[in-house]
Amino acid sequence: APVRSLNCTLRDSQQKSLVMSGPYELKALHLQGQDMEQQVVFSMSFVQGEESNDKIPVALGLKEKNLYLSCVLKDDKPTLQLESVDPKNYPKKKMEKRFVFNKIEINNKLEFESAQFPNWYISTSQAENMPVFLGGTKGGQDITDFTMQFVSS
């Protein structure tokens, strides 16, 4: 069976939207009005992995682009990157672990924990227009809570 996907946008808990600053990097910043069109639309695929009531494994692709968020070690540090894939083969139910995030729902907020690196989360800075990154701390200065907005296909 084909993998189930939905289109959505994400905003951090400070209401910053995610935009592409280039082919390989997402940034978080406040957008208003027409500028909201700039925000990235994700194709969130529900993939194979450890699942529970509040934890669902997903892959985050960029809609209509052969790019997926992935988690790799760079200079011995877990790092978030945009990785290009062959669109003929993706998305798939059994995604490689670097592409998998545990979508965790707590109090109507979402966290995205790397399946490859437990306790590392998709994060944004308090500051405006900074890269989205993989952070190893929750509840500190960096933001790990998001809300999801559904987008019609």
Epitope: M20, S21, G22, P23, Y24, E25, L62, K63, E64, K65, N66, Q81, L82, E83, S84, V85, D86, P87, K88
Partner: antibody
Framework: EVQLVESGPGLVAPSQSLSITCTVS????????VHWVRQPPGRGLEWLGV???????DYNSALKSRLSISKDNSKSQVFLKMNSLQTDDTAMYYC?????????????????WGQGTSVTVSS | DIVMTQSQKFMSTSVGDRVSITCKAS??????VAWYQQKPGQSPKALIY???NRHTGVPDRFTGSGSGTDFTLTITNVQSEDLADYFC?????????FGAGTKLELK
């Protein structure tokens, strides 16, 4: 053999719109992105935008309000439409295939280029 | 926008020489740089991708190096068919931007 062939009107009157078609062979538009680049006479290259294999687009923000890139995978054609042309839009317009190094995070340059189509904006 | 500066508009060389063409990015572009060769009346031809990798069929006298902000295209044992314009491209950030080009000519 990978080939890209641009076809355009040649001459466009000021304030009119430009439509160029890029017909490709030797690769699939559903798997490869295609860029548009232009080069004014005697000048350097300027990136206009890209259409991804999946159909998404990204544009040069300086031209975004005037540009539209689309494609028809079944006909192996990519289309560039540009509105409100002025004399400084006179250039050679190229389409170029995106490098596809899957698994790379820096996969967004061009490998094969078309021969270009010359566009002159003049009344 | 990221500015790619090719400070030498022209470079004079002789057949058999070694020549280095430089390109400087206004900010860190990692290794997201490509080099292109363009001969008069022709479209650009891809030489180097990801700063240092030769495209298929490109002679090994062409070598790319650099990362971050400083990049070099080196041609060893220059041949007459190498006389052309050379452009660098950064593809780290939108909009993708090219250097203004360096014209390689005979002394």
């Amino acid at each position: 053999e990978v080939q890209l062939v641009e076809s355009g009107p040649g001459l466009v009157a000021p304030s009119q719109s430009l439509s160029i078609t890029c017909t490709v062979s030797g690769f699939s538009l559903s798997r490869y992105s295609v860029h548009w680049v232009r080069q004014p006479p005697g000048r350097g290259l300027e990136w206009l935008g890209v259409i991804w294999g999946g159909g998404g687009t990204d544009y040069n923000s300086a031209l975004k309000s005037r540009l539209s890139i689309s494609k028809d995978n079944s006909k192996s054609q990519v289309f560039l439409k540009m509105n409100s042309l002025q004399t400084d839009d006179t250039a050679m317009y190229y389409c170029a295939r995106n490098t596809n190094y899957y698994g790379s995070t820096y996969d967004h340059a061009m490998d094969y280029w078309g021969q270009g189509t010359s566009v002159t904006v003049s009344s | 926008d990221i500015v790619m500066t090719q400070s030498q508009k022209f470079m004079s060389t002789s057949v058999g020489d070694r020549v280095s063409i430089t390109c400087k990015a206004s900010q860190n572009v990692r290794t997201a740089v490509a080099w292109y060769q363009q001969k008069p009346g022709q479209s650009p031809k891809a030489l180097i991708y990801l700063a240092s990798n030769r495209h298929t069929g490109v002679p090994d006298r062409f070598t790319g190096s650099g990362s971050g902000t400083d990049f070099t295209l080196t041609i060893t044992n220059v041949q007459s068919e190498d006389l052309a314009d050379y452009f660098c491209l950064q593809h780290w950030n939108y909009p993708l931007t090219f250097g203004a080009g360096t014209k390689l000519e005979l002394k």
